[in-house]
């Protein structure tokens, strides 16, 4: 092996591994093993992953690339990053939607579906936390609305008779006009 910079070929390091008869240099990310090297410490024959396949790491034994995942349209998923020879498709949710994991112990590879984010404005509430990794967190009712049951109800414009206690506390000032 030429120059002193070459990684030592001892079959034990990260650079060379025994493939077939010899210790061979692995294939770079985005390439698969077509044929192992034909001499000690030689380069394997590596080919670029075909379209719609990938290999993310340097490898010594992968004789085929992994198929790129397709984002699940049924689960409203979209491709945030298209597949390349070195990285799988990154699926996620479009703006205004959030990831709802389908398993309790949620990790990056867990199955998920996309849910539309709550529109706090439509619910007449303040937006406390914007929707991204989880649903929007809505806060208190907007001015001119009061809490009633699970929702926000518009302050009445006429008599106090139709205004319960919570309404009166929030909307009482309206009666002075």
């Amino acid at each position: 092996q030429g120059g002193t910079r070459s990684p030592r070929c001892d079959c034990a390091g990260d650079f060379h591994k025994k493939i077939g008869l010899f210790c061979c240099r692995g294939c770079p990310a985005g390439h698969y093993l077509k044929a192992p090297c034909t001499e000690p410490c030689g380069n394997s024959t590596c080919l670029v992953c075909p379209q719609d396949t990938f290999l993310a790491w340097e490898n010594h034994h992968n004789s085929e690339c992994a198929r790129c995942q397709a984002c699940d349209e049924q689960a409203s998923q979209v491709a945030l990053e298209n597949c390349s020879a070195v990285a799988d498709t990154r699926c996620g949710c479009k703006p205004g939607w959030f990831v709802e994991c389908q398993v309790s112990q949620c990790v990056s590879s867990s199955p998920f579906y996309c849910q539309p984010c709550l529109d706090c404005g439509a619910l007449h509430r303040h937006t406390r936390l914007l929707c991204s990794r989880r649903d929007t967190d809505c806060g208190t009712c907007l001015p001119g609305f009061y809490e009633h049951g699970d929702g926000c109800v518009s302050c009445p414009t006429s008599t106090l008779g139709s205004c319960p206690e919570r309404c009166a506390a929030v909307c009482g000032w309206r009666q002075m006009f």
Epitope: K18, G20, L21, F22, T38, E39, P40, C41
Partner: antibody
């Protein structure tokens, strides 16, 4: 005692197929790479194929690549050479051989050989 | 491919005399300080027999009249005192890289 006993040779027409076998005994077969070498009548030795131990990768010269298939059955201590699309020039004595690895430099030498089996390709 | 060329093609030597066979590789067969080449003996009607490996190491069971030398591209097989049973064809072979290649053979006879 290391022994390699060959079988499967014979007369075959051009374009035909033949499967050679090599039964090994006297050593741990699965731990050795194995090879086939042939010798045309009155000629020298020609390396034909090697199959590695463990992962069973196979190697061929261009002259037989895509026509010959080497395989092994470690459970049966046997080595095989499947020869397809045979040509007149494939005629010769075929030997199986054990490849012994020497030292830590990935260096192989054929230290035991079978008795040879004659393959004749003729119309 | 590495081409192995032997000389001479045939050789006649008297019993008890020294026999020398040469082998030249078209490129170096050296790797990590070892010459990846070997010598085989083939008697009529028999398979080849390994005599020398790594250019100069005598295989177990081979008589010590056989020796090998050389490095890089030039190698020599020497039989120090020829015996009748040494009549055979001798082949050099490289294992430096695939395809493995043999020399064309040297036929050794008694003069």
């Amino acid at each position: 005692e290391v022994q390699l006993v060959q079988s499967g040779g014979g007369l075959v027409k051009p374009g035909g197929s033949l499967r050679l076998s090599c039964a090994a005994s006297g050593f741990k077969f699965s731990s050795y790479a194995m090879s086939w070498v042939r010798q045309a009548p009155g000629k020298g030795l020609e390396w034909l194929s090697t199959i590695s131990d463990g992962d069973s990768y196979s190697y061929f010269p261009d002259s037989v690549k895509d026509r010959f298939i080497i395989s092994r059955d470690n459970a049966k201590n046997s080595l095989y050479l499947q020869m397809n699309s045979l040509r007149v020039e494939d005629t010769g004595v075929y030997y199986c051989a054990r490849d012994r690895i020497y030292g830590s430099v990935q260096y192989y030498a054929m230290d035991y050989w079978g008795q040879g089996t004659l393959v004749t390709v003729s119309s | 491919d590495i081409v192995m060329t032997q000389s001479p093609d045939s050789l006649a030597v008297s019993l008890g005399e020294r026999a020398t066979i040469n082998c030249r590789a078209s490129e170096s067969v050296e790797f990590s300080g070892t010459s990846l080449m070997q010598w085989y003996q083939q008697k009529p009607g028999q398979p080849p027999k390994l005599l020398i490996y790594a250019a100069s190491n005598v295989e177990s069971g081979v008589p010590d009249r056989f020796s090998g030398s050389g490095s890089g591209t030039d190698f020599t097989l020497t039989i120090s005192s020829l015996q009748a049973e040494d009549v055979a064809v001798y082949y050099c072979q490289q294992s430096r890289k695939l395809p493995y290649t043999f020399g064309q053979g040297t036929k050794l006879e008694i003069k």
